[in-house]
């Protein structure tokens, strides 16, 4: 009955503070409405990074002010988180909810450890 969610164990953000990873879920049923949430877990505290609800076959749309973007293809969601800094290094969990039709299913990934390294400032060139 449980829905399995797979995501990579580790991802290194780019020098521009962008990290991308795939969140894949094994849908027990034929969902038409799916909610994807990215959560950050630090010191056992969990906070929401971003969330989007989409209809199967349609594009994934995050809020305009979201730091996340994404695309969906079948049971796979390609997530990109932007504007990351070294202090944002942590475990990012992909949560998937099959909202419709019934029954509802919840899937929680094991999390992706995202490492963010702030770029060294360019040396002044005289």
């Amino acid at each position: 009955k449980a829905m399995h969610v797979a995501q990579p164990a580790v991802v290194l953000a780019s020098s521009r503070g962008i990290a991308s990873f795939v969140c894949e879920y094994a849908s027990p049923g034929k969902a038409t409405e799916v909610r994807v949430t990215v959560l950050r877990q630090a010191d056992s505290q969990v906070t929401e990074v971003c969330a989007a609800t989409y209809m199967m076959g349609n594009e994934l749309t995050f809020l305009d002010d979201s730091i996340c973007t994404g695309t969906s293809s079948g049971n796979q969601v390609n997530l990109t988180i932007q504007g990351l800094r070294a202090m944002d290094t942590g475990l990012y969990i992909c949560k998937v909810e099959l909202m419709y039709p019934p029954p509802y299913y919840l899937g929680i990934g094991n999390g992706t450890q995202i490492y963010v390294i702030d770029p060294e400032p360019c040396p002044d060139s005289d």
């Epitope: 009955k1 449980a2 829905m3 399995h4 027990p28 409405e33 909610r35 949430t37 959560l39 969990v46 906070t47 929401e48 969330a51 609800t53 969990i93 949560k95 909202m99 419709y100 019934p102 029954p103 509802y104 299913y105 919840l106 929680i108």
Partner: antibody, heavy 118, light 108 residues
Framework: QVQLVESGGGVVQPGRSLRLSCAAS????????MHWVRQAPGKGLEWVTF????????YYADSVKGRFTISRDNSKNTLTLEMNGLRPEDTAIYYC???????????WGQGTLVTVSS | EIVLTQSPGTLSLSPGERATLSCRAS???????LAWYQQKPGQAPRLLIY???SRATGIPDRFSGSGSGTDFTLTISRLEPEDFAVYYC?????????FGQGTKVEIK
């Protein structure tokens, strides 16, 4: 701090209606799914109904399907349970509960008692 | 529907003793989707354990959860006077959300 406060309970005759409310505060209400759970006197916990973030998706226990309606007003941070065709077996304390980020019910209200009796 | 069966129905123990509560599911429940709650008379339930073994905020480390598949356990390593209560397991991986019938931990 997170607070859930139920109201609207009372004594009602079989077949009549009652409307329960749950006022939420201390968190971004629209970011959480919500539930109603009930507990008959001296009995265990029974899940009653669920509502999604935007209120578009609702699920009900078979025992209340077609009689109870859950709704939410995200602008007023309020969860509502409309109960019609009440039966003596609906007598219980009704709790509203918030779904935590990882799925369990992390915060509960203090409950409101509904007694269905003639 | 996933049916959860808790045992024993009542556990009579003394403060300082170890309590072991069992929850068995009628079908496999992912360990990420199993919670334990504590309820004292006249109070709302309180989340203790989620994801089968993660303690909720503010829960003392004498409470621990374990198990996977269909068999789950809540252990209270040394019972304190405030631990005597009713404990419920719950699955939240799919609808309908279901609870076990509860285990009462009473003072012997």
């Amino acid at each position: 701090q997170v607070q859930l406060v139920e109201s609207g309970g009372g004594v009602v005759q079989p077949g009549r209606s009652l409307r329960l409310s749950c006022a939420a505060s201390g968190f971004t209400f629209s970011s959480y799914t919500m539930h109603w759970v009930r507990q008959a006197p001296g009995k265990g916990l029974e899940w009653v109904t669920f509502i999604s973030y935007d209120g578009n998706n609702k699920y009900y226990a078979d025992s209340v399907k077609g009689r109870f309606t859950i709704s939410r007003d995200n602008s007023k941070n309020t969860l509502t349970l409309e109960m019609n065709g009440l039966r003596p077996e609906d007598t219980a304390i009704y709790y509203c509960a918030r779904t935590g980020w990882l799925g369990p019910f992390d915060y509960w209200g203090q409950g409101t008692l509904v007694t269905v009796s003639s | 529907e996933i049916v959860l069966t808790q045992s024993p129905g009542t556990l009579s123990l003394s403060p300082g003793e170890r309590a072991t509560l069992s929850c068995r599911a009628s079908q496999s429940v992912g360990s990420s989707y199993l919670a334990w709650y504590q309820q004292k008379p006249g109070q709302a339930p309180r989340l203790l354990i989620y994801g089968a073994f993660s303690r909720a905020t503010g829960i003392p480390d004498r409470f621990s959860g374990s198990g996977s598949g269909t068999d789950f356990t809540l252990t209270i390593s040394r019972l304190e006077p405030e631990d005597f209560a009713v404990y419920y397991c719950q699955q939240y991986g799919s609808s309908p959300w279901t609870f076990g019938q509860g285990t009462k931990v009473e003072i012997k």
